[in-house]
């Protein structure tokens, strides 16, 4: 008789999840000499241990502590780029500006990027059929708790000027319910962080509005200022040209307004 299985509202674990995590770990540690000491099998065991045999609506940050310990990594604290709802451009930017880092440029972020996972209470099985949806099922699910944990630690590590890329095409350019708005903003350390600089990325070619005056940006400024951190904001009207000029600032188009 097939055992009854909980049906969740979200997609199931990404296929070949264990193999993907292990392969990503091996690749990352080969590319990043400072992480060569990491034992990827131990990393997978710690990752697995965080959610296997546990109810997928009852995961805690504590469950991920062994993984956090193994994945401890020092990135230059003044070179951190946060992002909200504009992941692709943020990653394109750090691929060119190699001395800046998003969370997904760290080992733990790289391992989990774009993946879904969950287990089942009291069985060692991974659930490939469905996993809890943050809204429809529960917030303390394996994926959400993982990102909350690593995002908090990443923000806590930041210092000096911290940059954040925000999507100017969204109705809420700054969203209090995003990971940036609910976790990272509140875990920047005022004794270490001098300024949060927001880069608002425009979508429309002819959109020359000053989105730094948007009410949600003013809300972000207010939250940040109350935490004794300075705030600045910059419109990026032409993200294509922005990336081009990051790649090659001496390109003649980058010394003109064309």
């Amino acid at each position: 008789v097939p055992r009854w299985r909980q049906q969740w509202s979200g997609p199931g674990t990404t296929k070949r999840f264990p193999e993907t995590v292990l392969a990503r770990c091996v690749k990352y540690t080969e590319i990043h000499p400072e992480m060569r000491h990491v034992d990827c099998q131990s990393v997978w065991d710690a990752f697995k241990g965080a959610f296997i045999s546990k109810h997928p609506c009852n995961i805690t940050e504590e469950d991920y502590q062994p993984l956090m310990k193994l994945g401890t990594q020092t990135v230059p604290c003044n070179k951190i780029l946060l992002w909200s709802r504009i992941k692709d451009l943020a990653h394109q930017f750090t691929q060119v500006q190699r001395d800046m880092f998003t969370l997904e440029d760290t080992l733990l972020g790289y391992l989990a990027d774009d993946l879904t996972w969950c287990g089942e209470f009291n069985t060692s099985k991974i659930n490939y059929q469905s996993c809890p949806d943050w809204r429809k099922d529960c917030s303390n699910n394996p994926v959400s708790v993982f990102w909350k944990t690593v995002s908090r630690r990443f923000a806590e590590a930041a210092c000096d000027v911290v940059h954040v890329m925000l999507n100017g095409s969204r109705s809420k350019i700054f969203d209090k319910n995003s990971t940036f708005g609910s976790v990272e903003v509140h875990n920047l350390q005022p004794e270490k962080v001098q300024t949060l600089e927001a880069w608002v990325i425009h979508g429309g070619r002819e959109d020359s509005r000053d989105l730094c005056q948007d009410p949600t940006i003013k809300e972000l400024e207010s939250i940040i200022s109350k935490r004794n951190i300075q705030f600045s904001c910059k419109n990026i009207y032409r993200p294509d040209k922005f990336l081009q000029c990051v790649k090659n600032p001496e390109d003649s188009s980058c010394t003109s307004e064309i």
Partner: nanobody
């Protein structure tokens, strides 16, 4: 704190010359790591980029080509705009600006307060 300070503006006769200076606070940035430029805004007109420099690359607006020269002194952390053969239509407030990556993709990182240049006929 002031990050870019322009000087050298003033009243000059048509055909004359002026050199504008823009001193950057070294505690903020080194000019050799930035794209540096000069903009101007004439009364009732939009601000326009007239000269810019990054590394070995320089660019000029057609209206000033052959008459204006942008240069930098990295040791002094200062950018200059040498303006020759001045015309009445060069009358404007001149602003120095700096950006980490370049101009024309977004808001510039830094601006000076501006210096007035008036060319009389």
């Amino acid at each position: 704190q002031v990050q870019l300070v322009e000087s050298g503006g003033g009243l000059v006769q048509a055909g004359g010359s002026l050199t504008l200076s823009c001193a950057a606070s070294r505690s903020i940035f080194e000019i050799n790591t930035m794209t540096m430029g000069w903009y101007r805004q004439a009364p009732g007109k939009q601000r326009e980029l007239i000269a810019a420099s990054r590394g070995a690359t320089t660019n000029y607006a057609d209206s000033v080509k052959g008459r204006f020269t942008i240069s930098r002194d990295n040791a002094k952390n200062t950018v200059y705009l040498q303006m020759n053969s001045l015309k009445p239509e060069d009358t404007a407030v001149y602003y120095c600006s700096a950006d980490r990556y370049g101009f024309g993709y977004g808001d510039n990182d830094y601006w000076g307060q501006g210096t007035q240049v008036t060319v009389s006929s």
